[in-house]
Interface confidence: low
């Protein structure tokens, strides 16, 4: 079926094109042969010029980008919102865990509080930073907490007779803490629980942030010139023939889109795997793999560990008295 | 004490926290997210079709444009397209993904590998070593009350404390701890933890 004769004056085409590119005189007054056209190859006279074709290509690619962004809007919002919500929730868990631990010290060991608050604060700060991706070693964090606590426990509770100026003994006490396993297996227990739960939490947040990155990447893809030409032919070449109201055929659109999005569609396999792997991770996030569970119970384990020290207090004081005697003498002088 | 509200009382490992229980827990929120994400599992494979359905396409019209001419919607020519002498659609597909897409695929592969290695195999939630060290050695339910790492006599049960994003009515930040909050009569050198 031959195309219907174009508008003898290209008037319709001009008024449409004006909306795309106001003020430009690129539309021929009357149909022209269009021998310079590269995309909308005419079968007869045409109302398009080379400049118009270029503008159509630009518009087509912009349209495509906007369609892609509107397609991903809901998914993008879902992940961005949840990433923010979980990050905030984890911060709240950390804050409450710190509060519970501080309250435990205040109510059970008031003599330790000023320093304990600081050590607990530093520990939970590191927990927060670890979740957000800092290069901090969980075992070091736990060791630092117990290394810092023991000198205070020793000087305030087990050997309160030491003068306040005795600070040199601290280094010796920190070393003794590990050598003598003064807290029993509690530090090891806490290390295992905290590292497992925090690792899972960290990877969960990393995965959500990568999800956002994936969508941002595909959202802002720059489509190739070839794709721009295909889109132009599909959406705009009909205008050159004065066919303003006609729409592309459905099957044709699918073929063009698959051509334009061949690269993007390659993500599909990995995207599916991403969602299923994330589901698997989430299903396992309970008990010692749930940071909420682990951190909110830390105060109790720390309490137990201090009780353990108290229980063995007599034996420890004697051993440490010998072990750290040199430090103490130096202080008393 | 001005620093700790009366409704938080910890003694002999009993934790009583008076606050409104919010039904939505973190784990339920995680599961809800996964369910919503699963509805987007075919997002990328469905994208070409989605875009066609959201851009002007002939649905009820008898005639449609196939890139070269006006044709009947159900004719052979409608599915074919006027590209024969232009450039090859197959070639366009063969070019492979853009570098940015390849990069993001690599990142996805990496995170998928990490997620798989981090996932807890069913029925293996507790490591043997942990069990031996006394973790969860008590009669604790799976969902409601979670036992929290403690050993010895006084096993503590904490009702899943943080109902999702439920800010408690108090805030016991270290910053608010005694010797750290500034009151009118407090000297600067009493603040011992301002940079902790």
């Amino acid at each position: 079926q031959p195309p219907p004769p174009p508008d003898a004056t290209c008037h319709q085409v001009r008024s449409f094109f004006q909306r795309l590119q106001p003020g430009l005189k690129w539309v021929p007054e009357t149909p022209v042969p269009g021998s310079d056209l590269q995309v909308c190859l005419p079968k007869g006279p045409t109302c398009c010029s080379r400049k118009m074709e270029e503008k159509y290509q630009l518009t087509a690619r912009l349209n495509m980008e906007q369609l892609l962004q509107s397609a991903s809007m809901e998914l993008k919002f879902l992940i961005i919102q949840n990433a923010a919500v979980f990050q905030e929730a984890f911060e709240i868990v950390v804050r409450h865990a710190k509060n519970y631990t501080n309250a435990m010290f205040k109510n059970n060991y008031p003599s330790l509080t000023p320093q304990a608050f600081e050590f607990v604060g530093e520990f939970f700060t590191d927990v927060s930073l670890y979740i957000l991706g800092s290069d901090i070693n969980v075992d070091d964090m736990v060791n630092e907490l117990f290394d810092s606590l023991f000198p205070v426990i020793y000087t305030q509770m087990m050997n309160p007779g030491l003068p306040e100026s005795v600070l040199d003994i601290n280094e010796c006490l920190r070393g003794a803490r590990r050598d003598l396993k003064v807290f029993g297996s509690f530090p090891k227990l806490i290390m295992t629980q905290v590292s497992k739960s925090l690792q899972v939490t960290r990877i969960f947040l990393q995965a959500l942030n990568l999800g956002i990155e994936v969508i941002n990447t595909t959202d802002h893809l720059k489509f190739s010139k070839d794709c721009g030409r295909m889109l132009t032919r599909m959406w705009y070449c009909s205008y050159c023939q004065g066919l303003m109201m006609v729409k592309p055929c459905g099957g044709y659109c699918n073929v063009v889109m698959q051509g334009c999005m061949a690269g993007v569609v390659e993500i599909d396999k990995y995207w599916r795997e991403y969602i299923l792997s994330l589901e698997e991770l989430v299903n396992g996030m309970y008990r010692i793999y749930d940071m909420e569970n682990v951190l909110l119970g830390l105060f109790s384990t720390i309490h137990d560990s201090i009780q353990y020290v108290q229980k063995n207090g007599g034996k420890l004081t004697t051993t440490i008295g010998k072990l750290c005697a040199h430090s103490q003498q130096r202080q008393y002088r | 004490s001005a620093y700790y509200p009366e409704d938080l009382f910890i003694d002999k490992k009993i934790l009583k926290v008076a606050h409104v229980e919010h039904e939505e827990t973190l784990s339920s929120r995680r599961r809800e997210l996964i369910q919503k994400l699963k509805s987007f599992i075919n997002f990328y494979s469905a994208l070409p079709g989605y875009i066609c359905s959201h851009s002007p396409v002939a649905e009820n019209d008898t005639l449609c444009w196939n890139g070269q001419e006006l044709v009947e919607r159900y004719s052979q020519k409608a599915a074919r397209n006027g590209m024969k002498n232009q450039f090859n659609l197959h070639e366009l597909k063969m070019k492979g993904p853009e570098p940015v897409v390849s990069q993001i695929i690599d990142k996805l592969k990496h995170i998928n590998q990490l997620l798989r290695t981090m996932s807890v195999p069913k029925g293996k939630v507790l490591d043997k070593s942990l069990d031996e060290e006394g973790l969860e050695s008590g009669d604790c339910g799976d969902d409601e009350d979670e036992c929290i790492g403690s050993s010895g006599d006084g096993m503590v049960k904490v009702k899943n404390q943080l109902r999702f994003l439920a800010e408690l009515a108090y805030d016991l930040d270290v910053d608010d701890a005694p010797g750290n909050k500034q009151h009118g009569n407090q000297k600067d050198n009493e603040i011992t933890t301002s940079h902790s």
């Epitope: 530093e122 800092s134 280094e171 | 805030d171 930040d173 603040i191 301002s194």
Partner: antibody
Framework: EVQLVESGGDLVKPGGSLKLSCAAS????????MSWVRQTPEKRLEWVAY????????YYPQTVKGRFTISRDNAKNTLYLQMSSLKSEDTAMYYC?????????????WGQGASVTVSS | DVVLTQSPLSQPVSLGDQASISCTSS???????????LHWYLQKPGQSPKLLIY???NRFSGVPDRFSGSGSGTDFTLKISRVEAEDLGVYFC?????????FGGGTKLEIK
């Protein structure tokens, strides 16, 4: 890349007010404590304000207490210093600095500074 | 407030030589948790200060190993084993064991 960019520095009369801003990028702003430090024309450094990551605990030295207010908007990744009742001795270059908490008070990143001149 | 006194005020040095800057505190900087919060910063001309060393002897990331910190209690030293042109500027010590945190008066490292 961690970046801190101060703005709002100006020439102001004694007794006047000024608000400095510090826009942070390249790190998780909401998890770090922050400080303002000033450098006098004689090149002496003086800490003027500190705020915890959540924003609920500001501290000041006696020299500025009651006149300066530090605040932060974690949603906007921005730190502020509201200065009022300014004196000529407040003339300085004002830097915002990130406290790397793991390093207790070591200020690991500083902005380029905002110049404040108090003069009649 | 804790007073930090740096010496010398100015340190003329030849490129490739070793330089040593001293920082003395009016009271001990050993914290009750066993850590000493004494830090060193370098301010190059026209720039803001940059962290070099934290907690007496720990080099901040990206700081060359020719910089080293030592000391305890009230006396601290920053050493630069082989001075390079890019090391010129003013060095400040700072403490955060006690509140408020304070800074030394600075030592200017310049070419002989």
């Amino acid at each position: 890349e961690v970046q801190l960019v101060e703005s709002g520095g100006d020439l102001v009369k004694p007794g006047g007010s000024l608000k400095l801003s510090c826009a942070a990028s390249g790190f998780a702003f909401g998890t770090y404590d922050m400080s303002w430090v000033r450098q006098t024309p004689e090149k002496r450094l003086e800490w003027v304000a500190y705020i915890s990551s959540g924003g609920n605990s500001p501290y000041y030295p006696q020299t500025v207490k009651g006149r300066f207010t530090i605040s932060r908007d974690n949603a906007k990744n921005t730190l502020y210093l509201q200065m009022s009742s300014l004196k000529s001795e407040d003339t300085a270059m004002y830097y915002c600095a990130r406290q790397n908490i793991a390093r207790r008070g070591a200020m690991d990143f500083w902005g380029q500074g905002a110049s404040v001149t108090v003069s009649s | 407030d804790v007073v930090l006194t740096q010496s010398p005020l100015s340190q003329p040095v030849s490129l490739g030589d070793q330089a040593s800057i001293s920082c003395t505190s009016s009271q001990s900087l050993l914290h009750s948790n066993g850590n000493t919060y004494l830090h060193w910063y370098l301010q190059k001309p026209g720039q803001s200060p940059k962290l070099l060393i934290y907690k007496v002897s720990n080099r901040f990331s990206g700081v060359p190993d020719r910089f080293s910190g030592s000391g305890s209690g009230t006396d601290f030293t920053l050493k630069i084993s082989r001075v390079e042109a890019e090391d010129l500027g003013v060095y400040f010590c700072s403490q955060s064991t006690h509140v408020p945190p304070t800074f030394g008066g600075g030592t200017k490292l310049e070419i002989k």
